[in-house]
Amino acid sequence: IIDGYKCKEGSHPWQVALLKGNQLHCGGVLVDKYWVLTAAHCKMGQYQVQLGSDKIGDQSAQKIKATKSFRHPGYSTKTHVNDIMLVRLDEPVKMSSKVEAVQLPEHCEPPGTSCTVSGWGTTTSPDVTFPSDLMCSDVKLISSRECKKVYKDLLGKTMLCAGIPDSKTNTCNGDSGGPLVCNDTLQGLVSWGTYPCGQPNDPGVYTQVCKYKRWVMETMKTHR
């Protein structure tokens, strides 16, 4: 997260880190005791999932292996549409005040809505500085019309933009797949943006979760 702040401890109990060994690979969001939602471009053969701590690499955090993941069937490595994936944990998480599932959206929030994005991604770009603490950034949803002024046809119908005018605050390497939460519901998953990160008036681009609720529910049901 560029130009963000340290998240209030325990305020993001649904936030997970997808690790490759001990190294941060992507963010993710707990949606059920067996399931984590993340970006399709975060796919690996297997994952180590850290839950229940704001500190990356925290020895006291829950760590659960995941060997199965289900990409949206329409994910395109060319256009990056449908950049969403479910990761099935090999064993259920132990829910607590530190580990909770996020609320999936009932509706799509409108432009102008205040949201928070979080992650352990680099706080500097292009040179990287990875924080140990979970970082947050407060951003507002931007209309597709406004966002298309920047990204033109790169912006797909189920992509969502967020940012703050003239501000550098944005997501970056390592934040991928992490949550954009608006009014206590999951509205976005970090997908992409321009590089170096933090160029003012280049919004962060997210997968718009409200458009995928049916796919999420059906996939979890099919593979429970």
Epitope: H41, T77, T171, S191, Y195, C197, V205
Partner: antibody, heavy 122, light 108 residues
Amino acid sequence: QVQLVQSGAEVKKPGASVKVSCKASGYTFTSEGIHWVRQAPGQGLEWMGSISASSGDTNYAQKLQGRVTMTTDTSTSTAYMELRSLRSDDTAVYYCARGAGYGARDWYFDLWGQGTMVTVSS
Amino acid sequence: DIQMTQSPSSLSASVGDRVTITCRASQSISSYLNWYQQKPGKAPKLLIYGASSLQSGVPSRFSGSGSGTDFTLTISSLQPEDFATYYCDQRYSTPPITFGGGTKVEIK
């Protein structure tokens, strides 16, 4: 330091295959994509394809589809490009390059290997 | 696929000259264009990304401009080490990534 180091020059007969390696060091290999670009003698640059080092997702240039395979070995931070059924017009310097970006997209090549000369001759 | 056309294909200039190279896209690519410099026997090196942003460590005599279909690389005062071939590439409609044909800058 941050670098991509490629394997040495190769001489191949028409119809043979070649496999060029590209070893990354000084950065997290799985966080970036690797692209392959070639340059025939005295000619311009031609994009061949790319691979995501973490997921293994590939995109290949249409004209090479079916003849090229790109792979990675994350345990050694090495990318590979194999080209089959070689022809004389495949004679070129082959470069690997790192795609700079984050998330699902990359935007430019900020790091290049030194190049590998592949000569196809009978 | 988007075609990138560079002009001129070669030019002769003297040290201290102002040099301009153009790259034209077959359709609008917004500002998703990069410029690279390549010296004989060496790998290309990034100069400019996003049409106008100077890559770290690149001298300020290099500048880029343009958006849509027409782009320019300018060297304000040519130095002996700038004699090389310059390429543009587009990152708007990818894959494939497409390069311009190159512009060779030679000593007059």
